[in-house]
């Protein structure tokens, strides 16, 4: 009897009530592996969740978060508020990055600007709340009169622009 059940493919279950016949999974259920004795009930993406991928007879539904939130936890078990670039999420909501830090995404924390001088470089483009500084060659690398490029910004670490 066990051998009969092992022949049941994904999307079916081994129906004990029908002499181990492979029956299709009922609506709103699935089996992702063969030889299953039952089909699992599909996840429902409702309320704070929306459907990213519909349930099929062989795979569970996949959920996403409603607009303004992004998934957190295993298989999107909860949703975390989005922030704007240049902000980070605190327990009280979105908060602007402090001076000297930036965040270029809708999630995550503000990170310190790169310290160009640690690599012997100078600040080519100043940092903002949304963007890291861009480091350029060190002043010593620029041979006098070799280029007409704009001289590097004063080596104020970490660099910033008015906000």
């Amino acid at each position: 009897l066990q051998d009969l059940c092992s022949n049941c493919p994904a999307g079916t279950f081994c129906d004990n009530n029908r002499s181990q016949i492979c029956s299709p999974c009922p609506p709103n259920s699935f089996s992702s592996a063969g030889g299953q004795r039952t089909c699992d009930i599909c996840r429902q993406c409702k309320g704070v969740f929306k459907t990213r991928k519909e349930c099929s007879s062989t795979s569970n539904a996949e959920c996403d978060c409603i607009s303004g939130y992004h998934c957190l936890g295993a298989e999107c078990s909860m949703c975390e508020q989005d922030c704007k670039q240049g902000q980070e999420l605190t327990k009280k909501g979105c908060k602007d990055c402090c001076f000297g830090t930036f965040n270029d995404q809708k999630r995550g924390i503000c990170r310190p600007w790169t310290n160009c001088s640690l690599d012997g470089k100078s600040v080519l483009v100043n940092g903002t709340k949304e963007r890291d500084v861009v480091c350029g060659p060190s002043p010593a690398d620029l041979s006098p009169g070799a280029s007409s490029a704009t001289p590097p910004a004063p080596a104020r670490e970490p660099g910033h622009s008015p906000q």
């Epitope: 599909c42 409702k46 309320g47 704070v48 909860m78 605190t90």
Partner: antibody, heavy 124, light 107 residues
């Protein structure tokens, strides 16, 4: 402050229809993320989900009680109404309404706010 | 419907004890599980959602773990106010279903 409050008869007779009202405050029933459930608990027994309604009027019923339950909402009155037909003594229980789809930095779909419950006795 | 089975149904413990309650689901539900605490005559109170995330204001002595079909609620050091009944609830689909409860009593 978010609250839910159940109201309705304390005593109903067998075969009668029970009508319970859940009045909510501090949030809107029209909010797309919010759902409200009715849950009951017979004396000394476990919690049992009865029915759930979403802002778009989508409804999900207990499999075993589906034929006896109806649920509706009146967004303007901030009320969700449960009716249960053909009451019998084993329906004696505390009936709760609860909200899911919380607000804030992290949202989820567990029941974060519950009403205090209303005890309903079915007896002739 | 998805069935949830809690064990034990009753548990006697003393203040300061470490207490563990198990909830088994009849099918895999990833981490779509919540835990509630209920005291006599009161409505249930949400403790944990998404299997392991503490609800705001819940003491850190409460923790949840597990995924798939087996979940646990742990109270690291039982306090007098923790004597209550605890319920698990699946958040996989509607209608939500609950376990039969675990009553934590004073030894």
């Amino acid at each position: 402050q978010v609250t839910l409050k159940e109201s309705g008869p304390v005593l109903v007779k067998p075969t009668e229809t029970l009508t319970l009202t859940c009045t909510v405050s501090g949030f809107s029933l029209s909010n797309a993320r919010v759902g409200v459930s009715w849950i009951r608990q017979p004396p000394g027994k476990a919690l049992e989900s009865l029915v759930h309604i979403f802002s778009n009027d989508e409804k999900f019923f207990s499999t075993s009680l589906k034929s006896r339950l109806t649920i509706s909402k009146d967004t303007s009155k901030s009320q969700v109404v449960l009716t249960m037909t053909n009451m019998v003594p084993v329906d004696t229980a505390t009936y709760y309404c609860a909200r899911n789809g919380g607000f804030g930095v992290i949202i989820h779909d567990a029941f974060d706010i519950w009403g205090q419950g209303t005890m309903v006795t079915v007896s002739s | 419907d998805i069935q949830l089975t809690q064990s034990p149904s009753f548990l006697s413990a003393s203040v300061g004890d470490r207490v563990t309650i198990t909830c088994r689901a009849s099918q895999g539900i990833s981490s779509y599980l919540a835990w509630y605490q209920q005291k006599p005559g009161k409505a249930p109170k949400l403790l944990i959602f998404a299997a392991s995330t503490l609800q705001n204001g819940v003491p850190s002595r409460f923790s949840g773990s597990g995924s798939g079909t087996e979940f646990t609620l742990t109270i690291s050091s039982l306090q007098p106010e923790d004597f209550a009944t605890y319920y698990c609830q699946q958040l996989n689909n509607y209608p939500r279903t609950f376990g039969q409860g675990t009553k934590v009593e004073i030894k």
